[in-house]
């Protein structure tokens, strides 16, 4: 079986995918769908997946959803949400992705790959 991808490589690939879907993008991602904002300080991968998994039929983020699934150790399904959700705060998918991207770059620079 193929050897597992090193965490640093996987994180870099996720960052690159988020860059791909946001570069020079002014039109709303996923038809302007709104998702729950999350607390970025802990458990970011599962929390991000729990939020984005509720967006369906948006090809632009399907790869991101799959990649986040690889980072999250437990199964995530639509409608599920942990305490990491920012209470009653919804933002557009595009802003969610940008905020996530900023945070993941910070983690990468700090060497926090898991």
């Amino acid at each position: 079986s193929p050897s597992p991808v090193p965490p640093s490589t996987a994180l870099k690939e996720l960052i690159e995918e988020l860059v791909n879907i946001t570069q020079n993008q002014k039109a709303p991602l996923c038809n302007g769908s709104m998702v729950w904002s999350i607390n970025l300080t802990a458990g970011v991968y599962c929390a991000a997946l729990e939020s984005l998994i509720n967006v369906s039929g948006c090809s632009a983020i399907e790869k991101t959803q799959r990649m986040l699934n690889g980072f999250c150790p437990h199964k995530v399904s639509a409608g599920q949400f942990s305490s990491l959700r920012v209470r009653d705060t919804k933002i557009e998918v595009a802003q969610f992705v940008k905020d996530l991207l900023v945070h993941l770059k910070k983690l990468f620079r700090e060497g926090q790959f898991n």
Epitope: K12, I15, E16, L18, V19, N20, I21, T22, Q23, N24, Q25, K26, A27, K98, L101, V102, K105, F108, R109
Partner: antibody, heavy 126, light 109 residues
Framework: EVQLVESGGGLVKPGGSLRLSCAAS????????MSWVRQAPGKGLEWVGR??????????NYAAPVKGRFTISRDDSKNTLYLQMNSLKTEDTAVYYC?????????????????WGQGTTVTVSS | SYELTQPPSVSVSPGQTARITCSGD??????AYWYQQKSGQAPVLVIY???KRPSGIPERFSGSSSGTMATLTISGAQVEDEADYYC???????????FGGGTKLTVLG
């Protein structure tokens, strides 16, 4: 002071090669996406290609007329951008500018090439 | 390959409003950027992300975008605004940059 200084231009015969360099200072070069833009004599600006920052994948993209002949690379330890030009044609004659593309940006928005070098002239002629 | 289309020239008298257009199929979803280039000089960014003005650029420069058309407006054009203006954007993938053919702005002194 934010600055970009190109070098390496000159006269070369058709089919020949040339490597341009662009030395950056005054900003965090490793964070920046960098582009090359050229301008043929009396003509408009033409996008040549760009390279992302290493953290954003370090990937390159090229305009159709130069794809397969030109290669953009970077050395973040030297704060330097490069343009390797092979199989040069007379129509590659131009002033070549390097330009920043998202200096210090932390995400994928494309802020425009807000810092430019003074340009270096490449002449391809027999 | 993707193209941005600009008028070759625009002429105004000093104090008049100059409008330079740029059309491209991807502009509804991709931002436009505008550069000013004076003779023998490197380009200078005057508008980014359709309508934002970098610091140091006079307020008379503004930008807008609607559908497949982006517009650079110079309200109360001055003689020193005489230059070539280029719109810049990317194709729909965001991966490939493109410039319009450029518009020569003449401010009739």
């Amino acid at each position: 002071e934010v600055q970009l200084v190109e070098s390496g231009g000159g006269l070369v015969k058709p089919g020949g090669s040339l490597r341009l360099s662009c030395a950056a200072s005054g900003f965090t070069f490793s964070n920046a996406w960098m582009s090359w833009v050229r301008q043929a004599p009396g003509k408009g600006l033409e996008w040549v290609g760009r390279i992302r920052s290493e953290i954003d994948g370090g990937t390159t993209n090229y305009a159709a007329p130069v794809k397969g002949r030109f290669t953009i690379s970077r050395d973040d330890s030297k704060n330097t951008l490069y343009l390797q030009m092979n199989s040069l044609k007379t129509e590659d004659t131009a002033v070549y500018y390097c330009a920043t593309d998202q200096v210090g940006a932390y995400y994928g928005d494309y802020y425009g090439m807000d810092v430019w070098g003074q340009g270096t002239t490449v002449t391809v002629s027999s | 390959s993707y193209e941005l289309t600009q008028p070759p020239s625009v002429s105004v008298s000093p104090g008049q409003t100059a409008r330079i257009t740029c059309s491209g199929d991807a502009l509804p979803e991709k931002y436009a950027y505008w550069y000013q280039q004076k003779s023998g000089q490197a380009p200078v960014l005057v508008i980014y992300e359709d309508s934002k003005r970098p610091s140091g650029i006079p307020e008379r420069f503004s930008g807008s975008s609607s559908g497949t058309m982006a517009t650079l407006t110079i309200s109360g054009a001055q003689v020193e605004d005489e230059a070539d203006y280029y719109c810049h954007s990317t194709d729909s993938s965001g991966n490939h940059g493109v410039f319009g053919g450029g518009t020569k702005l003449t401010v009739l002194g």
